[in-house]
């Protein structure tokens, strides 16, 4: 049981979603153990809490690790109100926190 | 300041249910911590049982995995523990307690509630 | 689940004494181990985070050592309120084990 740190993805919501008229941003976490690690939230900065959804996959029977997918979900006016998209990571196998993120409209 | 406190029956007849509250103040159980339940037996013997995370995601103890469930009321600020079909073998301390993500230790804990678990 | 076997079960010692206790995981759990003392009648307290870190608040006669699956506390000139018992645990992934506990007596 080898301490694995996640791989970590930050998606931007789909143009379809968008003409919805919601906004889901997605953090993904691939391959870690153990299954503890910390999401945050940031948009332009500012600490985000309270509208985001965590879900976390069985163990892989291959290798062990999780997955864990954390998602943001705004309206799409307050999507359009902020430009920069940030998530970090917590985990046992990071140092530090890693931080991924995107600036609304150059992706 | 983290402050936790246990409530609940301190005596449960064999087969039925023990239901324990862990009341959080000082902080909001929605931040960075994970929120857990441990037990002490009379022998000292201290068990983790489970936790809630601060998203709501749960880890329980395999031992007990067809028999607990940890929940949470975050308008309360409270997070509850269930245990099923108890035996006089769950006569114990239940202690709350909390880990912060990031240091993943227990520094928070409540004073603890003894249950009796008898007919 | 990972075992924590701590040695000795009791000991008994003088005011002023130097004691050493001893963990053992039964697998790698690298430095994600915590000391707890409990004293008759209340909760666990925190001691040592991290196999060697001092929690704050703890006099520096406290010291903690190792890593992998070989750890150690050591009180230098033991003092009256550090009898009690003294307990061992990892927090390396889920279960979350203790270790059995060594009662540190007054002689």
């Known amino acids: 049981r080898t301490v694995a740190a996640p791989s970590v993805f930050i998606f931007p919501p789909s143009d379809e979603q968008l003409k919805s008229g919601t906004a889901s941003v997605v953090c993904l976490l691939n391959n870690f153990y153990p299954r503890e690690a910390k999401v945050q939230w940031k948009v332009d900065n500012a600490l985000q809490s309270g509208n985001s959804q965590e879900s976390v996959t069985e163990q892989d029977s291959k290798d062990s690790t999780y997955s864990l997918s954390s998602t943001l979900t705004l309206s799409k006016a307050d999507y359009e109100k902020h430009k920069v998209y940030a998530c970090e990571v917590t985990h046992q196998g990071l140092s530090s926190p890693v931080t991924k993120s995107f600036n609304r409209g150059e992706c | 300041d983290v402050q936790l406190q246990e409530s609940g029956p301190g005596l449960v007849n064999p087969s039925q249910s023990l239901s324990l509250t862990c009341t959080v103040t000082g902080y909001s159980i929605t931040g960075d911590y994970a929120w857990n339940w441990i037990r002490q037996f009379p022998g000292n013997k201290l068990e983790w049982m489970g936790y809630i995370s601060y998203s709501g995601l749960t880890s329980y103890n395999p031992s007990l995995k067809s028999r607990i469930s940890i929940t949470r009321d975050t308008s309360k600020n409270q997070f509850f523990l269930q245990l099923n079909s108890v035996a006089t073998e769950d006569t114990a301390t239940y202690y709350c307690?909390?880990?912060?993500?990031?240091?993943?230790?227990?520094?928070?804990w409540g004073a603890g509630t003894t249950v009796t678990v008898s007919s | 689940d990972i075992q924590m076997t701590q040695s000795p079960a009791s000991l008994s010692a003088s005011v002023g004494e130097t004691v050493t206790i001893t963990c053992r995981a039964s697998?790698?759990?690298?430095?994600?181990l915590t000391w707890y003392l409990q004293k008759q009648g209340k909760s666990p307290q925190l001691l040592v985070n991290n196999a060697k870190t001092l929690a704050e608040g703890v006099p520096s006669r406290f010291s903690g050592s190792g890593s992998g699956s070989q750890f150690s506390l050591k009180i230098n000139s033991l003092q009256p309120e550090d009898f009690g018992t003294y307990y061992c645990q990892h927090h390396y992934g889920t279960p979350y084990t203790f270790g059995g506990g060594t009662k540190l007596e007054i002689k």
């Open positions: 697998e790698n759990i690298y430095s994600f």
């Open positions: 307690t909390s880990f912060y993500y990031g240091y993943w230790y227990f520094d928070v």
